[in-house]
């Protein structure tokens, strides 16, 4: 039961995380105009990964896409790439984890296959979450650098009467959504990896088992090997020792080939 709960929760948390990563990637508020120096502006600027927007006090909002690819900063391109990689990996992870869920039966899929799929999706979620966190952090770092650069520029060359107030940008809502979503995906991935351990057959815990062959020699076969070559198909192998108490989750409705060594 605990394994199913862990796996299911990991799936749900990752699903929410990936939805958040997608939302953050699509959001326009990656950076928003800093109003510290001009709180009464009638024009409010904010920018996303794909377009920049201007919202007027009148309620009118105008957005313009970044129609150039080569003219954009390399850092922005890198952030875009990280977020897209995160989404793609997350989406594949979700697809894999659906089939890996213990509560879903697909034909006669074995526990080992489900365990492998759970581990694969878990790793994908972890990498997806890391990509999102990295992407958002790179963008945040870029904002901080530009913020202090524009602050320095604001106080230079102001000896004359005319002020050129440079627009400074600060963290937008999308950054926080991205950080939280990346964290959730990461946590979900870790939970999937933990669930995988519970799903995997506990063959490695089996002690060496002695078999009485019909011949005059005694054969020893460690339980860790799945292959049963060298034995006749009709040989009945007895499980002498089960390394741990089997949880309710691990009870099979029908015997699988991993129930016996």
């Amino acid at each position: 039961m605990a394994v199913t709960a862990c796996q299911g929760l990991g799936f749900v948390v990752s699903l929410i995380g990936i939805a958040g990563i997608i939302a953050a990637t699509c959001m326009d508020q990656w950076s928003t105009q800093d109003l510290y120096n001009n709180p009464v502006t009638a024009v409010f600027n904010y920018q996303g990964l794909w377009r920049s927007c201007v919202r007027e006090s009148s309620g009118f909002t105008e957005c313009r896409g970044y129609f150039t690819l080569l003219g954009l900063p390399a850092m922005l391109q890198a952030v875009r790439a990280l977020m897209i990689v995160g989404i793609v990996l997350g989406a594949i992870g979700l697809l894999v984890s659906i089939f890996a869920l213990k509560c879903i039966r697909i034909g006669s899929m074995e526990d080992s296959a489900k365990a492998n799929m759970t581990l694969t999706s878990g790793i994908m979620f972890i990498v997806s979450g890391l990509c999102a966190i990295a992407g958002v952090s790179v963008f945040a770092n870029m904002l901080v650098t530009n913020f202090w650069m524009s602050t320095a520029n604001m106080y230079t060359g102001m000896g004359g009467m005319v002020q050129t107030v440079q627009t400074r940008y600060t963290f937008g809502a999308a950054l926080f959504v991205g950080w939280v979503a990346g964290g959730l995906t990461l946590i979900g991935g870790v939970m999937m990896c933990i669930a995988c351990r519970g799903l995997a057959p506990e063959e490695t815990n089996y002690k060496a088992v002695s078999y009485h062959a019909s011949g005059h020699s005694v054969a020893y076969k460690p339980g860790g090997f799945k292959a049963s070559t060298g034995f006749g198909s009709n040989t009945k192998n007895k499980k002498i020792y089960d390394g741990g108490a089997r949880t309710e989750d691990e009870v099979q409705s029908y015997p699988s080939k991993h129930d016996y060594v």
């Epitope: 009464v40 502006t41 024009v43 201007v54 006090s57 309620g59 313009r64 627009t167």
Partner: antibody, heavy 116, light 113 residues
Framework: QVQLKESGPGLVAPSQSLSITCTVS????????VSWVRQPPGKGLEWLGV???????NYHSALISRLSISKDNSKSQVFLKLNSLQTDDTATYYC??????????WGQGTLVTVSA | DIVMTQSPSSLAMSVGQKVTMSCKSS????????????LAWYQQKPGQSPKLLVY???TRESGVPDRFIGSGSGTDFTLTISSVQAEDLADYFC?????????FGSGTKLEIK
């Protein structure tokens, strides 16, 4: 077509309050912003404040303590209230509206004289 | 507050002449995000309400004759009347609509000789 019409008292005694109503037609106050602008005789234009479509307001910093702008969307009316009037508040008061930040439509104005 | 300075305060021109009036702002009115200048020009004929001529520094309001041309960027702006007509006798005001309070210039009075 779009029309704005101001109605005011004409004469106000010093230290009293001024109330002017701007009645609009041809557009909805829920989507248009309405500003108040005044012009002292023979002088330039002075922006007083604005009420936006969503009901939010901005006031001129010099008048913020004694100016209030409100509206009634259902009656298509915008109200200006200016307290503690002085003689230098004598001016023609205009309401001006627009969908954006500039003033595309203007009322004909109402002359307010502050005098004892 | 952004201070708007207009010059000249008045000018007299003959019909058909080209008229140029200037407006300077104490801060840049150019929004870097959409590359638009938040400046408008108004015409006020004697005894009338002001009328919008130009917004975004160079976009003519519908119904405004094409002899009225707005130009400039940042802090320096110009309203040009390419061929002045008798009906252009009026006061012309520039106004910034970039930040509140929205401030007007003191105006330029155009007289016809």
């Amino acid at each position: 077509q779009v029309q704005l019409k101001e109605s005011g008292p004409g004469l106000v005694a010093p230290s009293q309050s001024l109330s002017i109503t701007c009645t609009v037609s041809g557009f909805s106050l829920t989507s248009y912003g309405v500003s108040w602008v005044r012009q002292p005789p023979g002088k330039g234009l002075e922006w007083l404040g604005v009420i936006w479509g969503d009901g939010s307001t901005n006031y001129h910093s010099a008048l913020i303590s004694r100016l209030s702008i409100s509206k009634d969307n259902s009656k298509s009316q915008v109200f200006l209230k200016l307290n503690s009037l002085q003689t230098d508040d004598t001016a023609t008061y205009y309401c001006a509206g627009g969908l954006r930040l500039w003033f595309a439509y203007w009322g004909q104005g109402t002359l307010v004289t502050v005098s004892a | 507050d952004i201070v708007m300075t207009q010059s000249p305060s008045s000018l007299a021109m003959s019909v058909g002449q080209k008229v140029t009036m200037s407006c300077k702002s104490s801060q840049s009115l150019l929004n870097s995000s959409n590359q638009k200048n938040y400046l408008a020009w108004y015409q006020q004929k004697p005894g009338q309400s002001p009328k919008l001529l130009v917004y975004f520094a160079s976009t003519r309001e519908s119904g405004v004759p094409d002899r009225f041309i707005g130009s400039g960027s940042g802090t320096d702006f110009t309203l040009t009347i390419s061929s002045v007509q008798a009906e252009d006798l009026a006061d012309y005001f520039c106004q910034q609509h970039y930040s509140t309070p929205f401030t007007f210039g003191s105006g330029t009075k155009l007289e016809i000789k």
